[in-house]
């Protein structure tokens, strides 16, 4: 009795983070013995799609011509060979950006910061959100991922950095998201250039507690100024 069929490999081109309206192709690669490929989407009736293999039969293509909210989510694929179905692939998380208007990203007290001092990056969204992501250009993964502890909706999240070193210099953007689907992100914020001067090669710092703030009423500034902060967001390093 042969062992279980090896699991296929699942990936997306041009990538797994796709802007609304753009096309994306999901590939599932199995073995040359594959007769059929199946793609399942979490929380969707299975199978989400089936495809015959492309020659030489070791992979199949699943095309999404125009990315929308419905396609965002977590996928796995399988293939069927003469001896049965394979193990599921590792999951592919397909994320859509452009689901919400872009947040604004600020550096306080200034984007020009001296090494050894503190700076806070502030990401503010137009509508209340419960997840904020801060990314640095050319970094492989989000630097920081703030999520509300209790589903509380916030208009902003703070990303403190202290003490700042040369490592922190660079271009940042942030995204916001709702808890009901973390596969749907806002447009990216405009870029923020953080410039660190007088750089000393300090050890890599650990961030301090993150803070979120609720929006004020309509007769107050549209983004809160001087609201009492409360730590409703939990920090995740990725």
């Amino acid at each position: 009795q042969a062992g279980p069929l090896p699991k296929p490999t699942l990936w997306a081109e041009p990538g797994s983070v796709i802007s609304w309206g753009n096309s994306v192709t999901i590939w599932c690669q199995g073995t040359l013995e594959a007769r059929e490929y199946r793609l399942d989407k979490e929380e969707s009736p299975a199978p989400w799609d089936r495809q015959n293999p492309l020659e030489p039969k070791n992979k199949a293509r699943f095309s999404i011509p125009s990315m929308t909210e419905d396609y965002a989510g977590r996928y796995r694929c399988y293939y069927r060979s003469p001896v049965g179905w394979s193990q599921p692939s590792d999951p592919l998380e397909l994320v859509m950006t452009g689901a919400y208007s872009k947040p604004t990203l600020s550096a306080l007290p200034s984007p020009l910061v001296t090494s050894g001092k503190s700076v806070t990056l502030l990401c503010q969204s137009r509508s209340p959100m419960d997840t904020f992501l801060l990314i640095k250009e050319r970094a492989a993964h989000p630097l920081l991922h703030l999520r509300s502890e209790h589903g509380a909706q916030q208009h902003q999240a703070e990303f403190p950095m202290s003490p700042v070193t040369s490592v922190h210099g660079g271009t940042y953007r942030c995204f916001s998201s709702h808890g009901f689907s973390h596969y749907l992100l806002s447009h990216p914020s405009d870029p923020l250039e953080l410039i660190v001067s007088g750089s000393l090669e300090d050890p890599r710092p650990s961030p301090t507690r993150s803070v979120s703030t609720a929006a004020g009423p309509e007769d107050q500034p549209l983004m809160p100024t001087g609201s009492v902060p409360h730590s409703g967001l939990r920090r995740h390093w990725e």
Epitope: M96, K102, T104, T213, P221, M223
Partner: antibody, heavy 117, light 113 residues
């Protein structure tokens, strides 16, 4: 590309109501606020209010409260603004506009509403 | 409500020359939470809807020529067109988004001298 396409011109009698539509395309409709702005002939811009298609949340300028109603049909990506008890000073071009961050990055082409007896 | 006042009401500038439009708010538009000014500028040509030029007082919208520049802070703001082109003939509006109701300036009509 983002587009906001509004319904055609309307001529109404004083006291009547008008319902203007704004059909959105080219972006994720639910996640962006849509506002309405009034521009009387040869005059400036006046904010009327907004609707958030995701949950139907609305907020109106106090000046229009009681006379304006904004609604959304997510199935057709369309928002509506109804203005009741029309008077001559409601004669204007009415624009829908997509909010970016309280400012407006895309505008409809405008709908002319003429109130005349 | 925050009152936005533009000056001048109309302006005639020669092609290639600098045009400057001012906008004054009845209260500060500078947020202490993020040190940003909640002010936008729009251009409106006859028979067309307004077009966003500048937001956060000085950030140019994508696709807007770099001859358009916004400056100022607090209550006093300026839109500058560094070298006027024929296609810049329009009415320009400032808008505050610091608090509801959102309000606009009365507009400045820019013409060719």
């Amino acid at each position: 590309q983002v587009q906001l396409v509004q319904s055609g011109a309307e001529v109404k009698k004083p006291g009547a109501s008008v319902k203007v539509s704004c059909k959105a395309s080219g972006y994720s409709f639910s996640g962006f606020y849509i506002d309405w702005v009034k521009q009387p002939p040869g005059k400036g811009l006046e904010w009327i209010g907004y609707i958030f298609p995701s949950n139907g949340e609305t907020s109106y300028n106090q000046k229009f409260k009681g006379r304006v109603t904004m609604t959304v049909d997510k199935s057709t990506s369309t928002v509506y603004m109804e203005l009741s008890s029309l008077r001559s000073e409601d004669t204007a071009v009415y624009y829908c506009a997509r909010q970016a961050f309280y400012y407006f990055d895309y505008w409809g082409q405008g709908t002319t509403v003429t109130v005349s007896s | 409500d925050i009152v936005m006042t533009q000056s001048p009401d109309s302006l005639a500038v020669s092609l290639g020359e600098r045009a400057t439009i001012n906008c004054k708010s009845s209260q500060s538009l500078l947020s202490s939470s993020n040190q940003k000014n909640y002010l936008a500028w729009y251009q409106q040509k006859p028979g067309q809807p307004p077009k966003l030029l500048i937001y956060w007082a000085s950030t140019r919208e994508s696709g807007v020529p770099d001859r358009f520049a916004g400056s100022g802070s607090g209550t006093d703001f300026t839109l500058t067109i560094s070298s006027l082109q024929a296609e810049d003939v329009a009415v320009y509006y400032c808008q505050q988004y610091y608090s509801y109701p959102l309000t606009f300036g009365q507009g400045t009509k820019l013409e060719i001298k």
